[in-house]
């Protein structure tokens, strides 16, 4: 019961986290105009990974996409890549974890298969969360670096725009959403990995016992074999339990490639 709860909670937490990573990636407020020097501006600038926006006090907002790839800074491209990798891994992880959920029955899927799938999705969530946290942190570091470089006509590193003296950028809401979402995905992944341990069937360890029968000696060793007493007609050793000794190579592989346009 505790395993199912841990797995279910891990799934839900990861789902919320990945939704947050997607939201953060799409948000325009990765960096927002610092209003410290001019709190009464009639024009408010903010920028995302995909476009920059200007909100006028009139109520109108104008957004312009970064229609260049080569003209964009490498750091911004790296952040985009990290966030997209995080989303793709998270999405695949969610897909795998749905089939791995203990409460969902799919054919005659063994617990060991579900355990491996749970572990796989858990690892994917952890990597997804780390990608998001890394992406957001790289962007935040870029902002901090650029913050004091607010000299006239400076290159902002954000879509090749020319900066006037007054405008500096600070952390936007998307950064905090990204950090929280990445953390949640990471936590969800860890919970899935913990649940995996509980899902994996436990090995029954039998201590080696030596039976000294007349004429011959047979040692019964642990490793998944249960012996009869050696007396009477049933003298065969029956393999009644696999002991979960399946190799990683035997784990069923799942699709890991999705097309995101």
């Amino acid at each position: 019961m505790a395993v199912t709860a841990c797995q279910g909670l891990g799934f839900v937490v990861s789902l919320i986290g990945i939704a947050g990573i997607i939201a953060a990636t799409c948000m325009d407020q990765w960096s927002t105009q610092d209003l410290y020097n001019n709190p009464v501006t009639a024009v408010f600038n903010y920028q995302g990974l995909w476009r920059s926006c200007v909100r006028e006090s009139s109520g109108f907002t104008e957004c312009r996409g970064y229609f260049t790839l080569l003209g964009l800074p490498a750091m911004l491209q790296a952040v985009r890549a990290l966030m997209i990798v995080g989303i793709v891994l998270g999405a695949i992880g969610l897909l795998v974890s749905i089939f791995a959920l203990k409460c969902i029955r799919i054919g005659s899927m063994e617990d060991s298969a579900k355990a491996n799938m749970t572990l796989t999705s858990g690892i994917m969530f952890i990597v997804s969360g780390l990608c998001a946290i890394a992406g957001v942190s790289v962007f935040a570091n870029m902002l901090v670096t650029n913050f004091w470089m607010s000299t006239a006509n400076m290159y902002t590193g954000m879509g090749g725009m020319v900066q006037t003296v007054q405008t500096r950028y600070t952390f936007g809401a998307a950064l905090f959403v990204g950090w929280v979402a990445g953390g949640l995905t990471l936590i969800g992944g860890v919970m899935m990995c913990i649940a995996c341990r509980g899902l994996a069937p436990e090995e029954t360890n039998y201590k080696a016992v030596s039976y000294h029968a007349s004429g011959h000696s047979v040692a019964y060793k642990p490793g998944g074999f249960k012996a009869s007493t050696g007396f009477g007609s049933n003298t065969k050793n029956k393999k009644i339990y696999d002991g979960g000794a399946r190799t990683e190579d035997e784990v069923q592989s799942y699709p890991s490639k999705h097309d995101y346009v």
């Epitope: 009639a42 600038n45 020319v162 006037t164 003296v165």
Partner: antibody, heavy 118, light 113 residues
């Protein structure tokens, strides 16, 4: 047709109060930031106050801060300017104006005259 | 506060001639986010409210004759009437719409010579 009609102006003694109204028609007021601008007789234009579409942001000129209060009633499509502690230098024609692209004032009312005199 | 200074205070131009009004701001009105200058030009005729002519320093408001044009960037701006008509007699104001308070220039009175 877009129209802004100011009302509430008149003669008032120094230290007195007045409430100006601006009725909008031909557009939905709650989509736009709104301004009050005044013009003393024979003088230039002076911006007075601004209120954002949702009333979340309000700004005043230093000359009226603490004495004037801008407000709006979007369901009634109306803008208001409550003027207290009036002074002789507040004598002017008061215009309400609708904000537009580039923060420009695209539409203006005909104005209402406020005279502060003893 | 941003101070707007217009020159000249008054201008007399012959019909059909070019009229040029200058406006200087004490701070740059260029916004880095969209590379637009937040300066507006208005025309005010006697007994009438002001009328919007130009916004974003160079974008003509719909319905405004194309003889009116705006130019300039940063702190220096110009309103040009390419061929003066009798109906263009008015006072012209530039306005900072970049930072509050939204200050106006003192106005330039345009007359026919």
């Amino acid at each position: 047709e877009v129209q802004l009609v100011e009302s509430g102006g008149g003669l008032v003694q120094p230290g007195g109060s007045l409430r100006l109204s601006c009725a909008a028609s031909g557009f939905t007021l709650n989509n736009f930031g709104m301004h009050w601008v005044r013009q003393a007789p024979g003088k230039g234009l002076e911006w007075v106050s601004y209120i954002s579409s949702g009333s979340g942001t309000i700004y005043y000129a230093d000359s009226v801060k603490g004495r004037f209060t801008i407000s709006r009633d979007n369901p009634k499509n109306s803008l208001y300017l409550q003027m207290n502690s009036l002074r002789a230098e507040d004598t002017a024609v008061y215009y309400c104006a609708r904000a537009y692209y580039g923060n420009a004032f695209s539409f203006w009312g005909q104005g209402t005259l406020v005279t502060v005199s003893s | 506060d941003i101070v707007m200074t217009q020159s000249p205070d008054s201008l007399a131009v012959s019909l059909g001639e070019r009229a040029t009004i200058n406006c200087k701001s004490s701070q740059s009105l260029l916004n880095s986010g969209n590379q637009k200058n937040y300066l507006t030009w208005y025309q005010q005729k006697p007994g009438q409210p002001p009328k919007l002519l130009i916004y974003w320093a160079s974008t003509r408001e719909s319905g405004v004759p194309d003889r009116f044009s705006g130019s300039g960037s940063g702190t220096d701006f110009t309103l040009t009437i390419s061929s003066l008509q009798a109906e263009d007699v008015a006072v012209y104001y530039c306005q900072n719409v970049y930072s509050y308070p939204l200050t106006f220039g003192q106005g330039t009175k345009l007359e026919i010579k």
